[in-house]
């Protein structure tokens, strides 16, 4: 899906009045300079993009987040302000449901979401403060 | 954890080429842009080129442009520097680094390589 | 082409603060990152964007940068400390980057 012409001013307001408080509270007791970068993104499309890969495709370190509430409401967010977002969702979708397992929280599903945090955060700055 | 390892160098003859490669480990490598940076036997760091995230776009230092060329293959965690032209001036030990961008603004180099030196030498 | 300049050396005693600079036209409009150097080592971030500090540098080390001059400070010196430093700019209109000469720091 190209975010190109999602309302990223919509979105970011989703994000800052519910979506980051959820992902703190999954990360609870965990302080996030705990994991290094390893994730970038480097304009608010691309952002949107790597959000929706560590969001939603399962990685063999960290099966599902897809269930977690942060994760609903960030396909909610998408969907809502994101022009035909959601009809390309219907197929992924179901395809996860039928091979979803029990969800347990890792270190490694801590680390990722400690990844989509940094994501976000490189979201909400429209600029950077300098050249 | 996040490595980069840099390979390739060696002692070559003025003139000729020299393709050096740097493999990326422990972060999305296709999600940085990339630098190489060198620094002579005794002297200061000195920048040598970038490469966007996506390998859409490069910059280079004018004592290297016409003559360095940058790559990426994001598919393979790799970089690269084909080094032709290859002048005495160029001896050094090169590093690849990452750079988080920002549109077309390149970052802080967060994480670097260890090196590999580079001399030519008739 | 922009130009950076920080003093070929610095010596500090232990425990003291040292304070290395970095000088360019307007350097207070860039972002200035500062990367600490051992020899034989690869270079490595110390502080980014002016002041910020990576979560594996010790709080002793800070920078600041206004005007004509952006500077790295070093609180209470230690003998690890020595190493060569150096500062950084990325020029987006020019599209370059741009490092200073270097500035060795000697702990007494």
């Known amino acids: 899906y190209d975010f190109t012409n999602c309302d990223f001013q919509k979105i970011e307001a989703d994000y800052l009045r519910t979506i980051s408080k959820d992902l703190i509270t999954y990360m609870s007791g965990t302080k996030s300079t705990d994991f290094n970068n390893t994730v970038s993104c480097s304009n608010r499309p691309h952002c949107l993009t790597e959000i929706q890969s560590l969001t939603f495709n399962p990685t063999p370190r960290c099966a599902s987040l897809a269930k977690e509430m942060f994760a609903r409401k960030t396909k909610a967010t998408l969907a809502l302000w994101c022009p035909g977002y959601s009809e390309t969702q219907i197929n992924a979708t179901q395809a996860m449901k039928k091979r979803r397992k029990r969800k347990v929280t890792t270190n490694k599903c801590l680390e990722q979401v400690s990844q989509l945090l940094g994501l976000w955060r490189r979201f909400i700055r429209t600029l950077l403060k300098k050249q | 954890q996040m490595q980069l390892v840099e390979s390739g160098g060696g002692v070559v003859q003025p003139g000729r080429s020299l393709r050096l490669s740097c493999a990326a480990s422990?972060?999305?490598?296709?999600?940085?842009?990339m630098h190489w940076v060198r620094q002579a036997p005794g002297k200061g760091l000195e920048w040598v080129a970038v490469?966007?995230?996506?390998?859409?776009?490069?910059h280079y230092a004018d004592s290297v442009k016409g003559r360095f060329t940058i790559t990426r293959d994001n598919s393979k965690n790799t970089l690269n520097l084909q080094m032709n032209s290859l002048r005495a001036e160029d001896t050094a030990v090169y590093y690849c680094?990452?750079?988080?961008?920002?549109?077309?603004?390149?970052?802080?180099?967060?994480?670097w390589g260890q090196g590999t030196m580079v001399t030519v030498s008739s | 082409s922009y130009v950076l300049t920080q003093p070929p050396s610095v010596s500090v005693a232990p425990g003291q603060t040292a304070r290395i600079t970095c000088g360019g036209n307007?350097?207070?409009?860039?972002?200035v990152h500062w990367y600490q150097q051992k020899p034989g080592q690869a270079p490595v971030l110390v502080v980014y964007?002016?002041?910020d500090r990576p979560s594996w540098i010790p709080e002793r080390f800070s920078g600041s940068n206004s005007g004509n001059t952006a500077t790295l400070t070093i609180s209470r010196g230690e003998a690890g400390d020595e190493a060569d430093y150096y500062c950084?700019?990325?020029?987006?209109?020019?599209?370059?980057?741009?490092f200073g000469g270097g500035t060795k720091l000697t702990v007494l």
């Open positions: 680094a990452r750079s988080p961008q920002w549109e077309d603004i390149f970052e802080s180099m967060d994480v």
């Open positions: 422990g972060f999305t490598f296709r999600t940085y842009g």
């Open positions: 490469i966007w995230y996506s390998g859409s776009d490069t």
């Open positions: 307007y350097i207070g409009s860039f972002s």
């Open positions: 964007d002016d002041s």
């Open positions: 950084q700019i990325y020029v987006s209109a020019s599209r370059l980057v741009v």
